[in-house]
């Protein structure tokens, strides 16, 4: 004999009616639904001092459905959970809790970080960068000819941007000094433009080598703990002007 979904009817009581409304299989004038049609959930609704049986196509928010041979019923999710498949598998936590593997947590476990948008615990994502591209041609004021000292630049791409707790990205631009190839410039020859940005002439005391973009130095730091406040960065800007370092682009 086959069991069926909510089809087994209760023994008839004097006030039980077969002409039921809204998905009821059996009902009474006083208690409303007593059993439901297949694939419907039985729930009790309080109306004043009275509880009335209703049949629902899905359980309300904060409840989950459980199937039994003679009835499908709605059961409350755990107190910290808004929606769930069952008491052990929450799918959305109440405000202030983070969802991780079907559980609602006050804080995310070690190695994970809280995403305050989705209210989930997510893996920490570190920055990933590509290999360096080849160096650009050596140029001085946009010319690739002459006997002057010039600069050449190389770049790399960010493959994976870091999450809030992830390691910051290292520099994605690097510039170094070089000698422009030894050939005389033809009259009016402009030369190939280099890939580096045009920069102001260095001030007194500045290195005439690669000129740093001080903002970009932030991105070369590897761990969040090393992030500095603006005052410290200003201090460093002055110090860095005396150093010869690579140019990098902020992301």
């Amino acid at each position: 004999q086959n069991a069926s979904r909510g089809r087994r009817q209760r023994r008839m009581h004097p006030n039980v009616s077969q002409g039921c409304q809204g998905g009821c299989a059996t009902c009474s004038d006083y208690n409303g639904c007593l059993s439901c049609k297949p694939r419907l959930f039985f729930a009790l609704e309080r109306i004043g001092m009275k509880q009335i049986g209703v049949c629902l196509s899905s359980c309300p928010s904060g409840y989950y459905g459980t199937r039994y041979p003679d009835i499908n019923k709605c059961t409350k999710c755990k107190a910290d959970c808004d929606t769930c498949f069952n008491k052990n598998f929450c799918t959305k936590c109440k405000s202030g809790f983070y969802l991780h593997l079907g559980k609602c947590l006050d804080n995310c476990p070690e190695g994970l970080e809280a995403n305050n948008h989705t209210m989930e615990c997510v893996s920490i994502v570190h920055c990933e960068v590509s290999e360096w591209n080849p160096w650009s041609p050596c140029t001085k004021k946009g010319k690739t000819c002459g006997f002057k000292r010039g600069t050449e630049t190389r770049v790399r791409e960010i493959i994976q941007h870091p999450s809030a707790k992830g390691n910051l990205c290292p520099p994605t631009n690097e510039t170094r000094k070089c000698t422009v190839q030894r050939k005389k410039c033809q009259k009016g020859e402009r030369g190939k433009k280099g890939r580096e940005r045009k920069r102001k002439k260095p001030n007194k005391g500045e290195s005439k080598e690669a000129i740093p973009d001080s903002k970009s130095l932030e991105s070369s730091k590897e761990i969040p703990e090393q992030r500095e406040n603006k005052q410290q960065q200003k201090k460093r800007k002055v110090q860095d002007k005396q150093k010869s370092v690579s140019v990098s682009t902020v992301h």
Epitope: G65, T66, R67, Y68, F85, N86, F89
Partner: antibody, heavy 117, light 111 residues
Framework: QVQLVQSGAEVKKPGASVKVSCKAS????????IHWVRQAPGQGLEWIGY????????GYNQKFKNRVTMTVDTSYSTAYMELSRLRSEDTAVYYC??????????WGQGTTLTVSS | DIVLTQSPASLAVSLGQRATITCKAS??????????MNWYQQKPGQPPKLLIY???NLESGIPARFSGSGSGTDFTLTINPVEAEDVATYYC?????????FGAGTKLELK
């Protein structure tokens, strides 16, 4: 009667993305969550994740979390599962299924995905 | 993750005989008196089909020769008597925790 009809077979190159559809009929689409399960050739069943058509909330198996996106179009009673950065190990039959009170009671016919260079 | 270990991996049974498949969970799949264990049948080229829900309840339209039992970590699917149309692969599946997991399957053949 309840029916889930999935999109046709797909052949993709490694690194590409695929989007599989699952059209539901015979019931109110927003009443039950839709889950996706896959089965590699000659292998067992592996749960990918779920979506609630009523509000679009979704949840994924950690294994797929950074590569899978589930969406719905309630006007067409259709669920979608997109898998990105495909690799050869993603070659499998992908099923959608309705989840009724903690079990998968109706399944789509399956969509075969082949990932090959 | 809850790991479900099915045994045997394959099984050959004569028509009319009993087939017994077991599923052992790495941790309990019970909560509040309910067992979140389901059984599915899958025939080649077809999607799985629900047979048993909540460990022991027969899905509508499934023949009564299929039955399920067990609680906690140990569950059994019994087919008695086995018929020719029962040749298939059978999977257990737990719904108690995220992620939902399946057993590796048991292939039923005729002797």
């Amino acid at each position: 009667q309840v029916q889930l009809v999935q999109s046709g077979a797909e052949v993709k190159k490694p690194g590409a993305s695929v989007k599989v559809s699952c059209k539901a009929s015979g019931y109110t689409f927003t009443d039950y969550s839709i889950h996706w399960v896959r089965q590699a050739p000659g292998q067992g069943l592996e749960w990918i994740g779920y979506i609630y058509p009523s509000n679009g909330d979704s949840g994924y198996n950690q294994k797929f979390k950074n590569r899978v996106t589930m969406t719905v179009d309630t006007s067409y009673s259709t669920a979608y599962m997109e898998l990105s950065r495909l690799r050869s190990e993603d070659t499998a039959v992908y099923y959608c299924a309705t989840y009724f009170a903690n079990n998968f009671d109706y399944w789509g016919q399956g969509t075969t995905l082949t990932v090959s260079s | 993750d809850i790991v479900l270990t099915q045994s045997p991996a394959s099984l050959a049974v004569s028509l009319g005989q009993r087939a017994t498949i077991t599923c052992k969970a790495s941790q309990s799949v019970d909560y509040d008196g309910d067992s979140y264990m389901n059984w599915y049948q899958q025939k080649p080229g077809q999607p799985p089909k629900l047979l048993i829900y909540a460990a022991s309840n027969l899905e509508s339209g499934i023949p009564a020769r299929f039955s399920g039992s067990g609680s906690g970590t140990d569950f059994t699917l019994t087919i008695n008597p086995v018929e020719a149309e029962d040749v298939a692969t059978y999977y257990c599946q737990q719904s108690n925790e995220d992620p939902l997991t399946f057993g590796a399957g048991t292939k039923l053949e005729l002797k």
